[in-house]
């Protein structure tokens, strides 16, 4: 649908996008689950956090994640002022001082302890190609999304806009 190399054009200038404020415009505490209703859980093991994708037992409490929404200006190749519009970027924090990070070298998603200002690896561009599902695209690597691979979170390359609807990069947010 997009002509030039799918997602690369679709998200052409993420590297150049700048977050317009150091404060989030809103924050949202939610549990994170896959398109197939498996829960994303976080466990402290050997002084570091592990991330799991698993079926929860009945009545087992879901882990919550704090999603912080930031606005980011998007450079334009069309509009005269050089700014086409705004994107929403999110950071995801399951516990105080820990944030999800994209490790592009290892194609992995990791929890890192860090202080603000957060590094670019902690920011993900928010997409929703379904009304009730979201996807998270790496700010540092356009066209690469958080996805599910072998019951773990991983970074998955999406090579065309049609594949933005692929189930393994779709996540559901819920308050319960």
């Amino acid at each position: 649908a997009f002509g030039i190399s799918g997602v690369q054009k679709y998200t052409r200038a993420l590297h150049d996008s700048s977050i317009t404020g150091i404060s989030p415009i809103t924050e949202y505490l939610a549990s994170l689950s896959t398109y197939n209703d498996q829960s994303i859980t976080f466990a402290l093991e050997d002084e570091s956090y592990e991330i799991y994708v698993e079926d929860l037992k009945k009545d087992e409490k879901k882990d919550k994640v704090l999603l912080s929404y930031y606005e980011s200006q998007h450079p334009s190749n069309e509009s005269g002022d050089g700014v086409d519009g705004k994107m929403l970027m999110v950071t995801l924090s399951p516990t105080k001082d820990f944030w999800l990070h994209a490790n592009n070298k290892e194609h992995s998603v990791e929890l890192h302890k860090c202080e603000k200002p957060l590094p670019d690896q902690a920011f993900f561009v928010l997409h929703n190609m379904h009304s009730n599902c979201v996807s998270f695209e790496c700010k540092t690597d356009p066209g690469v999304f958080i996805g599910v691979k072998d019951n773990h979170l991983a970074l998955i390359k999406v090579d065309s806009s049609e594949n933005l609807c692929t189930e393994n990069i779709l996540f559901k947010l819920s308050e319960t």
């Epitope: 679709y10 190749n77 519009g85 997409h127 806009s161 609807c165």
Partner: antibody, heavy 121, light 106 residues
Framework: EVQLVETGGGLVQPGRSLKLSCKTS????????MYWIRQAPGKGLEWVSS????????YYPDSVKGRFTISRDNAENTIYLQMSSLRSEDTATYFC??????????????WGQGSLVTVSS | EIQMTQSPSVLSASVGDRVTLSCKAS??????LDWYQQKLGEAPKLLIY???NLQTGIPSRFSGSGSGTDCTLTINSLQPGDVATYFC????????FGGGTKLELD
């Protein structure tokens, strides 16, 4: 400058069909959710349809589901609303709107001026 | 489907007044709420997004607040140009408008 211009409205008999167009300019059309919203004379706003940036998913309220179809042409920067089996209660001004943010269905950042559809015999 | 209820449906106020408009959702909408202003014969215009963020170019006398199911639009020091109908809009689950509040001058 962002512009959205609706065309195709007019007088139509009950049970007949009509197709609205919304031609846009001034933004990267293929990266935005797009919407149709309507307003009956003297009444409030009613969401009518939404479409994702790549056109792969479309959404409707029960009041128009099965009768209205939203579509888009990303090469022409245009969205459409095909309305069939029209009823008198579909009489309204139809606005197209663009999402406020790239890639997400949050907020209606810009609206067109609207196109009046009158369903009457 | 989430229902959005605005009150009052009509509000009369004087220039300089502080005006408060209410919007109540039938379930938690997680601050996924906008306010739109529609003047007579015009298209609606985005004023406030994500409950409390002012859209570029909108005067600072407009502000939004709230969480959960209850949200409020406040206009500090009402101006003649603020006469309009104001609609709330949720996008937490589907898309729904409130019925609107028509703001008039005394």
């Amino acid at each position: 400058e962002v512009q959205l211009v609706e065309t195709g409205g007019g007088l139509v008999q009950p049970g007949r069909s009509l197709k609205l167009s919304c031609k846009t300019s001034g933004f990267t059309f293929s990266s935005y959710w797009m919407y149709w919203i309507r307003q009956a004379p003297g009444k409030g706003l009613e969401w009518v349809s939404s479409i994702t940036p790549n056109g792969g998913n479309t959404y409707y309220p029960d009041s128009v589901k099965g009768r209205f179809t939203i579509s888009r042409d990303n090469a022409e920067n245009t969205i459409y609303l095909q309305m069939s089996s029209l009823r008198s209660e579909d009489t309204a001004t139809y606005f197209c709107a663009k999402g406020h943010y790239y890639y997400t269905s949050y907020s209606l950042g810009y609206w067109g001026q609207g196109s009046l559809v009158t369903v009457s015999s | 489907e989430i229902q959005m209820t605005q009150s009052p449906s009509v509000l009369s106020a004087s220039v300089g007044d502080r005006v408060t408009l209410s919007c109540k959702a039938s379930q938690n909408i997680n601050k996924h709420l906008d306010w739109y202003q529609q003047k007579l014969g015009e298209a609606p215009k985005l004023l406030i997004y994500f409950t409390n963020n002012l859209q570029t170019g909108i005067p600072s006398r407009f502000s939004g607040s709230g969480s959960g199911t209850d949200c409020t639009l406040t206009i500090n020091s009402l101006q003649p140009g603020d006469v309009a109908t104001y609609f709330c809009f949720q996008y937490n689950n589907g898309w729904t408008f409130g019925g609107g509040t028509k703001l008039e001058l005394d």
